[in-house]
Interface confidence: low
C-alpha cells in the first residue's frame, strides 16, 4: 500500500489517531523531512552553549559556544574552554607551551617548532610559545661566491635510478 503519510510536509507529523489534519509540530519540536510520524525535540542551547540559529518547525536549533569556549565535534556537540595563544588545555586547565613548542590559536595543543635544519635551512626568526620559528636560506646559500643564478638540481622521479 502507498504510504499516504508522505502527504505530510516538513514541519508537520502524520498522526493517525486523533488529528484530522497533518498536525503541525508542537512548540519546541521540528520535522525536517516530510512523512514523519513524530516531530523531534528541538535542541536547547543552554549553559556553555548559545543559540546561533533558532529552532523552527522544519529545522533544529544550531548552537555555538559562549565567549571563552569553542565548539568541538559535529554540529558543535561540545564546548571546550579557550586558552590563550602560547597555551594548551590539559586536565588541570590551561598550561603554557613547553620550550620548543608553540600554539598560535586559542584551542588545540602545543606543536613543536619546525626543525629548519631538516630542510637544510637556518633559523631566521626564533620561535616563541605563540609562534613557530621562521626558516631562512641554508647557511651555504649565504656563503660568499654562491651564485643565485645556479639552476636547482632536477628532481628525480621516484623509482628511477640516476642517469
Amino acid at each position: 500500500l502507498q504510504d499516504l503519510c508522505s502527504n505530510c510536509p516538513a514541519g508537520t507529523f502524520c498522526d493517525n489517531n486523533r488529528s484530522q489534519i497533518c498536525s503541525p509540530c508542537p512548540p519546541n519540536s521540528f520535522s525536517s523531512a516530510g512523512g514523519q510520524r513524530t516531530c523531534d525535540i528541538c535542541r536547547q542551547c543552554k549553559g556553555v552553549f548559545k543559540t546561533r540559529k533558532e529552532c523552527s518547525s522544519t529545522s533544529n536549533a544550531e548552537c555555538d559556544c559562549i565567549s571563552g569556549y569553542h565548539c568541538l565535534g559535529a554540529e558543535c556537540s561540545m564546548c571546550e574552554q579557550d586558552c590563550k595563544q602560547g597555551q594548551e588545555l590539559t586536565k588541570k586547565g590551561c598550561k603554557d607551551c613547553c620550550f620548543g613548542t608553540f600554539n598560535d590559536q586559542k584551542r588545540g595543543i602545543c606543536r613543536p617548532w619546525t626543525n629548519c635544519s631538516l630542510d637544510g635551512k637556518s633559523v631566521l626568526v626564533n620561535g616563541t610559545k605563540e609562534r613557530d620559528v621562521v626558516c631562512g636560506p641554508s647557511p651555504a646559500d649565504l656563503s660568499p661566491g654562491a651564485s643565485s643564478a645556479t639552476p636547482p638540481a632536477p628532481a628525480r622521479e621516484p623509482g628511477h635510478s640516476p642517469q
Epitope: L1, Q2, L4, C5, C14, R18, I21, C22
Partner: antibody, heavy 119, light 107 residues
Framework: QVQLQQPGAELVRPGASMKLSCKAS????????INWVKQRPGQGLEWIGN????????NYNQKFKDKATLTVDKSSSTAYMQLSSPTSEDSAVYYC????????????WGQGTTLTVSS | DIQMTQTTSSLSASLGDRVTISCRAS??????LNWYQQKPDGTVKLLIY???RLHSGVPPRFSGSGSGTNYSLTISNLEQEDIATYFC?????????FGGGTKLEIK
C-alpha cells in the same frame, strides 16, 4: 484489492429512521477512517463526518451533527450511517470513502447508495 | 468553513485538447488539495492528492499545480474516457469541503 461495498438503492418513509451500510474489504479495516459524503441530485459533494473503526472515534460536520450517527461493526468490517427523521432533503446519493489520516485524500470510494425518502 | 470555488461549472473541449480546471480556496490551504473524477455513472476516483501527486494507476496526462489559495488540474491530451465531473477538495481543516465541480464535455 480495496473495496467499499454499498447497496445500490434504499427507499425509506419520511420520519422512519434508517441505516446505510458500507462493507470494507482488501485492507485493515481498523487502520483507516471511514467517511461519509452526501451528493444531492445535480449538486456537489458534502462531507458528513467520519469514524475511526479502531475505537469508534467520530468527527462530524456541524451541519449533520443532529442528522447522522456513525457506527462500525469491526467483526464484519462494516461501517454504518444512521439518518434520523429522514425528509425529502435527505434524498441523495451517499458515498462511503476511506482516508488514512487527516489531510490525506479519500483514496477509495464506494459506489454510493441512492437514498429515496418518499411516502 | 473553508469555501472551495470552481468558477467554471461546465467546460467543452475537443479530444486531444489540453484542458485546465481551476479551484480557489477561501483561505490558504497549504497545498492540502485533492482532485477527484466522477464518471456519469456516479463512480468517484481519486486523481491527484497534495496538489500535484498522482494517485496510483492514474494516467500521467493528468497533472496538478498551485499553492496558497489557487489550484488547477490539467489534462494534457483529452481522451473520451476523461468525460466526467471533476471536484477539488481541501484537506487542511475540518470540515472537509469540496468545490462545486466542473463538468467536462466533448465539443
Amino acid at each position: 484489492q480495496v473495496q467499499l461495498q454499498q447497496p445500490g438503492a434504499e427507499l425509506v418513509r419520511p420520519g422512519a429512521s434508517m441505516k446505510l451500510s458500507c462493507k470494507a474489504s482488501g485492507y485493515t479495516f481498523t487502520s483507516y477512517w471511514i467517511n461519509w459524503v452526501k451528493q444531492r441530485p445535480g449538486q456537489g459533494l458534502e462531507w458528513i463526518g467520519n469514524i475511526y473503526p479502531s475505537d469508534s472515534y467520530t468527527n462530524y460536520n456541524q451541519k449533520f451533527k443532529d442528522k447522522a450517527t456513525l457506527t462500525v461493526d469491526k467483526s464484519s468490517s462494516t461501517a454504518y450511517m444512521q439518518l434520523s427523521s429522514p425528509t425529502s432533503e435527505d434524498s441523495a446519493v451517499y458515498y462511503c470513502t476511506r482516508l488514512y489520516y487527516g489531510s490525506s485524500p479519500f483514496d477509495y470510494w464506494g459506489q454510493g447508495t441512492t437514498l429515496t425518502v418518499s411516502s | 468553513d473553508i469555501q472551495m470555488t470552481q468558477t467554471t461549472s461546465s467546460l467543452s473541449a475537443s479530444l486531444g485538447d489540453r484542458v485546465t480546471i481551476s479551484c480557489r480556496a477561501s483561505q490558504d490551504i497549504s497545498n492540502y488539495l485533492n482532485w477527484y473524477q466522477q464518471k456519469p455513472d456516479g463512480t468517484v476516483k481519486l486523481l491527484i492528492y497534495h496538489t500535484s501527486r498522482l494517485h496510483s494507476g492514474v494516467p500521467p496526462r493528468f497533472s496538478g499545480s498551485g499553492s496558497g489559495t489557487n489550484y488547477s488540474l490539467t489534462i494534457s491530451n483529452l481522451e473520451q474516457e476523461d468525460i466526467a465531473t471533476y471536484f477539488c477538495q481541501q484537506g487542511h481543516t475540518l470540515p472537509r469541503t469540496f468545490g462545486g465541480g466542473t463538468k467536462l464535455e466533448i465539443k
